[in-house]
């Protein structure tokens, strides 16, 4: 849990943060695990410790190994491990998988690519950005603070993006590069605030005492697959499972359907052997997704027996 993988390229700066966090006032000691040798704090060394940070200025392949950091406070010590691997620079353009940071995905509306690990470094704008080793040019690409914005994203924008910046340490400059993949999400689908189709808000449903009754909560959430969407029933503001009335049960699972291309869900509430006290309850149909939550309230009323007299 308290071990972290870090990697870099030879002759570039690499800064690693101790996986164990502490207050800035706590002292942090760093050791090279294989030899248990203490890492110096003097900045004249190529590899030195600076509080929670371990700095390789610049890094060498031989620096690879496991480093131990111990966060010391007056009341406890916490130990973390940094597994550092320094790789030789590739002669060709290909960036191997082991040098890749996490993949990010974007869409027409949201296309930010953050430069990985940049917050650890002392850098100044602007960043340089490359896609598949080609410098990015054109008005569609905007380097903004620590991220790249791509306007009007297209599927062809998918690929490996490298950010390059200069780390400054006591007047000396060191180059840093970091690469991550960018994928483009198909935005044919969309989601919107839930729209409850049934029941109507403040609907009064007629039921017969002693008979069974069903209430259906049905809502639509947008077009295409909806990743976060749910419909559910509540009784007097409480989950059905917490309400503790075995006669009143929610159908297991939600039925998905498509109406006019919209993704919809419905959930049936089954009331067995309707009793007088059920008429006093407030039944809330809730529809929620990543945008928001809507609720429609239903109350039950006794269905009048049919009058057969003329």
């Amino acid at each position: 849990k308290f071990s972290k993988q870090s990697w870099g390229l030879e002759n570039e700066a690499l800064i690693v943060r101790c996986p164990r966090q502490g207050k800035p006032s706590y002292t942090v000691d760093w050791y090279y695990s294989q030899t248990n040798k203490s890492i110096p704090t003097q900045e004249r060394n190529r590899v030195f410790a600076s509080g929670q940070l371990l700095k390789f200025l610049p890094a060498a392949v031989a620096d690879s190994g496991i480093y131990t950091c111990i966060v010391r406070s007056p009341t406890f010590n916490r130990t973390g491990y940094a597994n550092v691997t320094i790789y030789k620079k590739q002669s060709d353009c290909n960036v191997p998988d082991y040098l890749m940071y996490s993949t990010v995905s974007g869409s027409e509306k949201n296309s930010k690519i953050y430069c990985p690990t940049i917050d650890l470094y002392n850098w100044t704008a602007p960043l340089e950005w490359f896609k598949n080793c080609q410098a990015l040019q054109g008005s569609r690409y905007r380097a903004h603070k620590s991220f790249l914005v791509i306007d009007n994203v297209m599927t062809e924008d998918a690929g490996d993006y490298t950010c390059k910046f200069i780390h400054n340490e006591n007047g000396a400059n060191y180059s840093v590069t970091a690469t991550r993949s960018f994928t483009v999400k198909d935005e044919q689908g969309f989601s919107l605030f839930p729209v409850i189709g049934a029941p109507a808000q403040n609907e009064i449903k007629e039921v017969e005492i002693g008979k069974n009754a069903n209430l259906t909560c049905s809502a639509c959430f947008g077009k295409g697959t909806q990743f976060l969407a749910a419909v559910l029933w509540q009784l007097n503001g409480t989950k059905i499972t917490d309400f503790g009335e075995p006669r009143i049960q929610q159908e297991e699972g939600q039925n998905q359907s498509f109406s006019n291309g919209l993704a919809c869900l419905d959930m049936v509430l089954r009331i067995a052997d309707v009793k007088e006290e059920d008429l006093l309850l407030q039944y809330d149909c809730l529809a929620l997704n990543l945008h928001g939550l809507r609720r429609h309230t239903v109350r039950l009323s006794r269905k009048n027996p049919i009058d057969h007299h003329s």
């Epitope: 919107l192 605030f193 808000q201 976060l228 749910a230 559910l232 509540q234 503001g237 409480t238 989950k239 917490d242 809730l286 929620l288 997704n289 990543l290 945008h291 928001g292 939550l293 809507r294 609720r295």
Partner: antibody, heavy 116, light 107 residues
Framework: QVQLVQSGAEVKKPGSSVKVSCKAS????????ISWVRQAPGQGLEWMGG????????NYAQKFQGRVTITADESTSTAYMELSSLRSEDTAVYYC?????????WGQGTLVTVSS | DIQMTQSPSSLSASVGDRVTITCRAS??????LNWYQQKPGKAPKLLIY???SLQSGVPSRFSGSGSGTDFTLTISSLQPEDFATYYC?????????FGGGTKVEIK
């Protein structure tokens, strides 16, 4: 039945942060959504963002993106709104409200004054 | 963002008057419009949701109408407790936006 109780008034210096809490009672908090709305003195209402605790998803108004953080603690049925890099124009009453987008019931409001 | 324009920004009326406030959206929002009432020093209170549905506990003298871009809040017979500021809010898409408010004052 549903009640939202907010934390007390705050006086803050420019550049600092403020964290306002909103404790909910009278319902199942996990199946709520909480919106945050502010109102500067003598001005109208401005939606800042909202959270759906069941999914852990948050929506922010673009204007506040990067400066506001909305969180929720289901164990205490409390929602929080933290606004950073405060400036004098952030002086306002901050409200939490139940549900999003239809704000059915509201907290009493928390006055945040930003002054040097 | 969807802009909401309310008019008038203020009006003076007497108890018993019929009062109409209008709200216009910068694009169609179907029937996704809410009306709120706010009294000085108090939090807003939801009156009407989905353009025309009366929120539970709200007096029937309040009514809402409209769809698409043009909406109306009507108070059929103004009561002393109705003197307040009224806001419309679109509930169609984020960011949620409010109208600038209409202050209803005693004539």
């Amino acid at each position: 039945q549903v009640q939202l109780v907010q934390s007390g008034a705050e006086v803050k210096k420019p550049g600092s942060s403020v964290k306002v809490s909103c404790k909910a009672s009278g319902g199942s908090f996990s199946s709520w959504a909480i919106s945050w709305v502010r109102q500067a003195p003598g001005q109208g209402l401005e939606w800042m963002g909202g959270i759906i605790p069941l999914f852990g998803t948050v929506n922010y108004a673009q204007k506040f993106q990067g400066r506001v953080t909305i969180t929720a603690d289901e164990s205490t049925s409390t929602a929080y709104m933290e606004l950073s890099s405060l400036r004098s124009e952030d002086t306002a009453v901050y409200y939490c409200a139940r549900d999003l987008p239809d704000m059915v019931s509201w907290g009493q409001g928390t006055l945040v004054t930003v002054s040097s | 963002d969807i802009q909401m324009t309310q008019s008038p920004s203020s009006l003076s009326a007497s108890v018993g008057d019929r009062v109409t406030i209008t709200c216009r959206a910068s694009q169609s929002i179907s029937s996704y419009l809410n009306w709120y009432q706010q009294k000085p020093g108090k939090a807003p209170k939801l009156l009407i949701y989905a353009a025309s549905s009366l929120q539970s506990g709200v007096p029937s003298r309040f009514s809402g109408s409209g769809s698409g871009t043009d909406f109306t809040l009507t108070i059929s017979s103004l009561q002393p407790e109705d003197f307040a500021t009224y806001y419309c809010q679109q509930s169609y898409s984020t960011p949620l936006t409010f109208g600038g408010g209409t202050k209803v004052e005693i004539k």
